[in-house]
């Protein structure tokens, strides 16, 4: 259905962050859910040295957090 | 402001590897919940989504061609790859690289033109 | 994978008209669809996040909306920016899947 040559064009507005107010980032399924479905990761048995399983699930940070900033313990906001 | 640019070969001949490069800005893939990926789209036709790959190098991976792709990034450059081994004359299309966050594909490029032909 | 059943195809319509186009997912995806616009220049655009949200600068004639498996973009009184193409998409899990497009044309 595309035709013709192509054109950048951006948006522009701010990004967005990645999960609305009251929505947080659900590593299992990777994208956004309300924060009263988010599940809690099972205890790591003493001595495992195993990863964190994947479906530990945290709070979204706000985009253009630079490298090595933590995950803020908040949902995301616009 | 967010934006995203493709480059690729253009043109290249059946059983060669594409390898194209989503260059971008206004983002970090070192943020937690962001992703980048890959979707195509033939002449005439619809979108096919590829691969994507997020801030912590989980990789997804269209079942379908999941044996010819591989994506990677380089987080320090703001740039993601997407290789296509053993292309065919199928592989001619736009293929566009996009921003994924929490919503799936916010920001998408503007798409570069690759055309397999001997 | 998750079929995205996209109708209509194509879609006559006249300035001012109140249009809605339509996707069906063949299993579960929540709220968990997107609507985009592709220009004839190949430009894509996310119109709508998570079925039913505006993107920032999207005009407030876009909505979505959903009824049971059916996703709907409505544009209330069409303008003609508008007669171009559009995609929904889901990512309730991967793969993603694209509906196969609807082409709206002015009558």
């Known amino acids: 259905m595309r035709r013709g040559p192509r054109s950048l064009r951006g948006r522009d507005a701010p990004a967005p962050t990645p999960c609305v107010p009251a929505e947080c980032f659900d590593l299992l399924v990777r994208h956004c859910v309300a924060c009263g479905l988010l599940r809690t990761p099972r205890p790591k048995p003493a001595g495992a040295s195993s990863p964190a399983p994947r479906t530990a699930l945290q709070p979204q940070e706000s985009v253009g957090a630079g490298a090595g900033e933590a995950a803020l313990p908040l949902p995301g906001l616009l | 402001q967010v934006s995203l640019k493709e480059s690729g070969p253009g043109i290249l001949q059946p059983s060669q590897t594409l390898s194209l490069t989503c260059s971008f800005s206004?983002?970090?893939?070192?943020?937690?919940?962001?992703?980048g990926g890959w979707v195509r789209q033939p002449s005439g036709k619809g979108l096919e989504w590829l691969a994507h790959?997020?801030?912590?190098?989980?990789?997804y991976y269209n079942p379908a061609l999941k044996s010819r792709l591989t994506i990677s990034k380089d987080t320090s450059k703001n740039q993601v790859f997407l290789q296509i081994a053993n292309v065919d004359t199928a592989d001619t299309a736009t293929y566009y690289c996009?921003?994924?966050?929490?919503?799936?594909?916010?920001?998408w490029g503007q798409g570069t033109s690759v055309t397999v032909s001997s | 994978d998750i079929q995205m059943t996209q109708s209509p195809s194509s879609l006559s319509a006249s300035l001012g008209e109140r249009v809605s186009l339509t996707c069906r997912a063949s299993?579960?995806?929540?709220?968990?669809l997107n609507w985009l616009q592709q220009e004839p220049d190949g430009t894509i655009k996310r119109l709508i996040y998570a079925t039913s949200r505006l993107d920032s600068g999207v005009p407030k004639r876009f909505s979505g909306s959903r009824s049971g498996s059916d996703y709907s973009l409505t544009i209330s009184s069409l303008e003609s920016e508008d007669f171009v193409d559009y995609y929904c998409l889901q990512y309730a899990s991967s793969p993603y899947t694209f509906g196969g497009g609807t082409k709206l044309e002015i009558k």
């Open positions: 996009a921003r994924i966050a929490g919503y799936a594909m916010d920001y």
């Open positions: 299993q579960d995806i929540g709220s968990n």
């Open positions: 790959i997020w801030w912590d190098e989980d990789k």
């Open positions: 206004g983002f970090s893939l070192s943020t937690f919940g962001m992703g």
